[in-house]
């Protein structure tokens, strides 16, 4: 291929005309197409939905599109021994049985196959005692429970309910509690939104509704049978008692009708203060267990879920680069769901489809990307990230030599009031640019830029003017790619204005009422939503493959890196006595980051100076930003975590959906004072401060001057 | 020379209130979070509370919370702590401290004495 062949057809076939080929119309009809039956991870219908996307995608014009399968560890109900929680009398008579299924939705009642409410990986129990309600079942929860209230949940079935944090933080932090199993249920205070109705008439929680989901702690480890390593053909895999992640005391998710049942019999301990009270007419007490009339009675769980080796599918399309086939820009998002998957994921897999349908139009007139384009259909997404962190450890080699970013599309909309962003630093620019060429589709809006309303909407805490752009936590398929293997990553989607419920995702969230009507219906009927998603990401894609030189900017890193430490340096400062006495300095780290900040200035001014037409002087600079984000990386990894590698940048110890900053110096310092060997914890915090600042000032040395 | 020089403090009635004043010279700290810190007689350095850059976001030992307001004023380069309600358990010696936008170590002030006594 000649050097040229690209930028040749790219005046014809550039940026506009990709984005002008992006349809709406067409998003639904894949929506509609990818949401008619379940496609759970694992199953027939998912194997023949990939089949369909290879087939669709090589119609596109794709160069190639192949089937990548892995043998991993999933979960699944027992079809003839149904999961369900009792409230049970003296004489152990069940007088209370939580409900087997969800009421389908209208027109689903006769479809097959759709899976019981369930927690993934939950192991096999019966566990009966007294309940105590946890509130969110977060560390701050935990810290009230048991040093303010000195309430003991050793023994006792836990209920929480679901929001702020992951679900698999709560049952961790249930099982260091010393719980033997846990219920958690959707409140209406975080799943029901007010003054909107129930679905089917509207897009909140019923009763009867219920939120699936994993409960795996597997920090980033991929198939909880084989980490660090594909699952192919030949793996070794571990014994369930070795496997990464798994929880070891049963778990079962409920809807707000049965936890009424559970929640209004509590007695013991008032509700420290209004935020352990939710909006279910029942006192919240936390117990342990049930008020006078009914202490005899206990909660039992019946728990028969389980965990199967089973093949799963990605479709991994290519669309080679005609300039630089060797680097790889990817857009990936996954296709299992728990159900009908009408937000997640389908509401992203179409919109992947028709980024796929753009872009092979284009191919089919004669242009190609100047780098390659990968594009990804993961699967078993919901069961812990396992599609793409096999193919990311299959292909970890290629990856860290060839990745340039890595976009990811899952559900396009948690609402439709604004965009939102998470993404690295090094992509802060590229997306302003870009959102500034965008339409807005916002009401009151017309005729203003995607820009415009989203700064107006969401604005920066810190930059007045620009709009707010959130650091990547985990929770998704980027994890791999970022986390461990250090490939500039971003997403982007439509969402809430409920800045407070961050993290409890939309009320139909891995319900059997996310279906296409929802979305058609209540939050994107125009699908216009849909649409500047697809642009935003698309235009991303399309952005990082075919530009000259790569949209990145070290300088926004930069900025980030002073006010990161500053604020880790906040949090030490909170013990001022026991820096004084351990000689606990962050000067190495400060002068790290002054020292980045002027690399980079200077590498800035080298990037708009050099010679573009010189091919290997542009690779070197390209090089030297794409290598950037990859210098972050340690490859030891954060303590106990070896798959999040990430030196600025991890999932929150608290919270997997949520990112922390200098995570290796933040959990050194968190709850320090608690800790029985106060020399050895600060011990462990200089340990941490030296880490990132060599960290950081190695990865300014990458910007410098390479000779 | 850079430096912070704290003032404002004195002898007060308990329940009385009192606001120190931070004044920043050769020094430019708007780039970065300011913090409180004191000294009881006899006793270890105790965190009172932090301003972040913007001014936005503010945290306070739980003793102190309802009771302090940290505030600044980035034009003067002036960081302030209003403290009512005054306990006898609030005497110590006040320090601020912060860091240049262009320094790589911390700067603390000398500090300003504040005695609660009836």
């Known amino acids: 291929k000649s050097s040229n062949e690209a930028t040749n057809i790219t005046p014809k076939h550039n940026m506009k005309a990709f984005l002008d080929e992006l349809k709406a119309e067409n998003i639904k009809k894949f929506l509609y197409n990818f949401t008619q039956i379940p496609h759970l991870a694992g199953t027939e219908q998912n194997f023949q939905l990939a089949k369909q996307i290879q087939s669709q995608w090589k119609e596109f014009g794709l160069d190639s599109v192949e089937l990548a399968h892995y043998d991993v560890l999933l979960s699944y109900p027992n079809k003839t021994h149904p999961n369900y929680i009792s409230i049970i009398n003296e004489d152990g008579n069940e007088i209370f049985n939580t409900s087997l299924f969800e009421p389908p939705p209208p027109g689903y009642e006769n479809v097959s196959d759709i899976v019981p409410p369930f927690s993934a990986f939950s192991p096999q129990g019966m566990p009966e005692g007294d309940l105590v309600y946890v509130n969110y079942a977060r560390t701050e929860d935990f810290f009230k429970l048991e040093r303010d209230m000195k309430i003991n949940c050793s023994g006792k079935i836990v209920i929480a309910r679901y929001g702020k944090v992951f679900r698999g933080n709560k049952v961790k932090n249930a099982q260091l509690a010393g719980a033997k199993g846990v219920i958690l249920y959707s409140d209406p205070a975080d799943y029901f939104a007010p003054g909107v109705k129930s679905y089917p008439d509207g897009w909140n929680l019923p009763g009867g509704g219920v939120q699936r989901g994993n409960i795996l702690n597997l920090n980033g480890a991929g198939d909880p049978l084989t980490p660090g390593y594909p699952a192919n053909e030949y793996a070794y895999r571990r014994g369930i008692a070795e496997a990464v992640g798994l929880p070891s005391i049963p778990v079962h998710p409920i809807g707000y009708y049965d936890a009424q049942k559970l929640l209004e019999k509590m007695g013991g301990s008032a509700p420290p203060d209004s935020s352990w009270r939710g909006s279910l007419k029942v006192p919240y007490n936390v117990g342990p267990g049930f008020t006078g009339n009914f202490s005899t009675q206990k909660v039992k769980m019946h728990i028969h879920s389980t965990n199967e080796v089973t093949r799963i599918y990605n479709v991994i399309g290519t669309l080679r680069g005609a300039v630089e086939p060797d680097r790889y820009v990817i857009l990936g998002g996954h296709r299992d769901s728990w159900v009908f998957g009408g937000i997640d994921p389908q509401s992203g897999a179409a919109v992947v489809h028709e980024i796929v349908r753009s872009f092979g139009t284009l191919k089919k007139e004669g242009w190609r990307p100047r780098r390659t384009i990968l594009f990804a259909s993961w699967d078993a997404e919901e069961f812990g990230l396992l599609g793409s962190t096999e193919w990311a450890e299959e292909n970890s080699r290629l990856l860290q030599e060839r990745g340039v970013a890595y976009i990811n599309a899952d559900s396009s909309i948690e609402g439709n009031y604004t965009l939102r962003v998470d993404c690295t630093p090094l992509m802060y620019s590229l997306v302003h640019n870009l959102t500034k060429e965008l339409k807005s589709p916002d009401e009151g809006f017309e005729g203003k830029s995607l820009y415009e309303s989203w700064t107006k909407k969401s604005p920066s805490p810190e930059f007045s003017g620009m709009p707010r752009i959130s650091k990547l936590g985990s929770g998704n398929d980027f994890e791999v790619f970022f986390q461990r293997l250090g490939i500039a990553s971003g997403r982007a989607r439509y969402t809430k204005n409920w800045e407070t419920n961050k993290f409890s995702g939309y009320p139909l969230y891995h319900s059997v009422y996310e279906t296409y009507e929802l979305v058609e219906k209540f939050y994107d009927p125009m699908f216009k939503y849909h649409l500047t998603v697809a642009q935003v990401r698309g235009g991303m894609v399309f952005e990082l493959a075919n530009s000259i030189v790569l949209p990145f900017d070290c300088r926004d890193y930069a900025v980030v890196l002073r006010k990161y430490a500053d604020k880790i340096y906040s949090i030490s400062m909170k013990h001022p006595q026991e820096m004084k006495t351990y000689s606990v300095s962050f000067d190495s780290l400060f002068s790290a980051v002054k020292n980045f900040t002027e690399i980079a200035s200077k590498f800035s001014e080298r990037l708009q100076d050099f010679d573009k037409s010189n091919p290997i002087v542009l690779r070197m600079m390209n090089d030297q930003l794409m290598f950037l984000e990859r210098a972050f990386i340690d490859p030891l990894g954060l303590p106990d975590r070896p798959f999040y590698r990430h030196v600025i940048y991890a999932p929150s110890s608290h919270n997997k959906y949520a990112g922390e900053s200098f995570p290796g110096i933040y959990d050194a310092l968190f709850d320090i004072e608690s800790k029985v060997d106060p020399s050895k914890a600060w011990g462990e915090v200089k340990r941490q401060i030296y880490v990132a600042a060599f960290t950081v000032q190695a990865a300014a040395e990458t910007l410098s001057e390479v000779a | 020379e850079v430096q912070l020089v704290e003032s404002g403090g004195g002898v007060v009635q308990p329940g009385r209130s009192l606001r120190l004043s931070c004044a920043a010279s050769?020094?430019?700290?708007?780039?970065?979070?300011m913090h409180w810190v004191r000294q009881a007689p006899g006793k270890g350095l105790e965190w009172v509370a932090t301003i972040y850059q913007d001014g936005s976001e503010s945290e306070y030992v739980d003793s102190v919370k309802g009771r302090f307001t940290v505030s600044r004023d980035d034009a003067k380069n002036t960081l302030y702590l209003q403290m009512d309600s005054l306990r006898a358990e609030d005497t110590a010696t006040y320090y601020c401290?912060?860091?240049?936008?262009?320094?790589?170590?911390?700067?603390w002030g000398l500090g300003t004495l504040v005695t609660v006594s009836s």
């Open positions: 050769g020094f430019t700290f708007s780039s970065y979070a």
């Open positions: 401290v912060g860091r240049d936008s262009t320094s790589i170590t911390p700067v």
